[in-house]
Interface confidence: low
């Protein structure tokens, strides 16, 4: 079966890292510099992504895989495959169309990206506030007053932080 398919389409035998060169009787030619083919049987190699300027190279391009970029200091990735770099703010801020703005009272952002999120409402879990929240940090919930009897555990560790959303563009 494989042999029959190969006779019908000689290009199917060209492995990743090569392309089927129509100009050379459909032989498998290596991808030229700064190009790649990640799968076999390709008739062209794709141009490598260039990580320039605000983008910096996280992984170099090879003949079988594209380059991967991240962002230079002061920026963070947005989109699939780091298709964009968005400017950072400071912890305790979020990026708005007016620039980096401090989180409103009752909200926090512990990263340089994303939006300010509301402090955890400890009372919803029947707990009390052990450590007050700030612009940069969520509140720490402690045990409810009823739990403070002798022998009870004194501190409940905070729940894991939720994944922050992206700031609006």
């Amino acid at each position: 079966f494989e042999r029959t398919r190969s006779l019908q389409d000689p290009c199917s035998n060209c492995p990743a890292g090569t392309f089927c060169d129509n100009n050379r009787n459909q032989i498998c030619s290596p991808c030229p510099p700064n190009s790649f083919s990640s799968a076999g049987g390709q008739r062209t190699c794709d141009i490598c992504r260039q990580c320039k300027g605000v983008f910096r190279t996280r992984k170099e391009c090879s003949s079988t895989s594209n380059a991967e970029c991240d962002c230079t200091p002061g920026f963070h990735c947005l989109g699939a495959g780091c298709s964009m770099c968005e400017q950072d703010c400071k912890q305790g801020q979020e990026l708005t169309k007016k620039g980096c703005k401090d989180c409103c009272f009752g909200t926090f952002n512990d990263q340089k990206r994303g939006i300010c999120r509301p402090w955890t409402n400890c009372s919803l879990d029947g707990k009390s506030v052990l450590v007050n929240g700030t612009k940069e940090r969520d509140v720490v919930c402690g045990p409810s007053p009823a739990d403070l009897s002798p022998g009870a555990s004194s501190v409940t560790p905070p729940a894991p932080a939720r994944e922050p959303g992206h700031s609006p563009q």
Epitope: K52, G74, Q87, D88, C89, Q93, L95, K97, G99, Q169
Partner: antibody, heavy 117, light 110 residues
Framework: EVQLVESGGGLVQPGPSLRLSCTAS????????MTWVRQAPGKGLEYIGF???????SYASSVKGRFTISRDDSKSIAYLQMNSLKTEDTAVYYC???????????WGQGTLVTVSS | DIQMTQSPSTLSASVGDRVTITCQSS????????LSWYQQKPGKAPKLLIY???DLASGVPSRFSGSGSGTEFTLTISSLQPDDFATYYC??????????FGGGTKVEIK
Amino acid sequence: EVQLVESGGGLVQPGPSLRLSCTASGFSLSHYWMTWVRQAPGKGLEYIGFINVGGDTSYASSVKGRFTISRDDSKSIAYLQMNSLKTEDTAVYYCGRGGLTFGWDLWGQGTLVTVSS
Amino acid sequence: DIQMTQSPSTLSASVGDRVTITCQSSQSVYSNSFLSWYQQKPGKAPKLLIYSASDLASGVPSRFSGSGSGTEFTLTISSLQPDDFATYYCAGVYSDNTYVFGGGTKVEIK
């Protein structure tokens, strides 16, 4: 009042250095990226560079290596340090606030730098 | 180097006219939309009119509008007012962090 005020311009000979200041009032400088642009007499606007909230900088190729942008958020001042001045650096220098994403939404009145022997 | 070409360089118009200024970049601006328009009057600082190609800056009259994507952009003044006679600049942001201004378009009274 929300404003930016540039200072430090004047007449200088070619070669020496000059530092321009951009003083912010009415808003928190630490929340904003800052830029410097210049305008030679009778010419258009030319981008010089920017500094982001974290202190990272980027410069136009025409000034890279000679000009340095810095900031002191505690004093609400952004600076433009200009070294090895040339006659072609003669221009009105403006500072602006904002960011690459959303444009520069507030500008100072400008300060004139004349480089002449 | 990236070139940002504005046309026309000078435009004579009358109050009430619809005015269109174009800006062409030699390469795509960052994210295809990071382009701003500024207005400048003699002896004054620039004023932001439009950002992200089409978003109106705070306090700017709605007669100003922007459009375009990639390498071609347009600033339109739907009905020219006496206060609009000025020089207009486009400025693009590119992936190497640079900000390039166009050469400017002077809108003068016909």
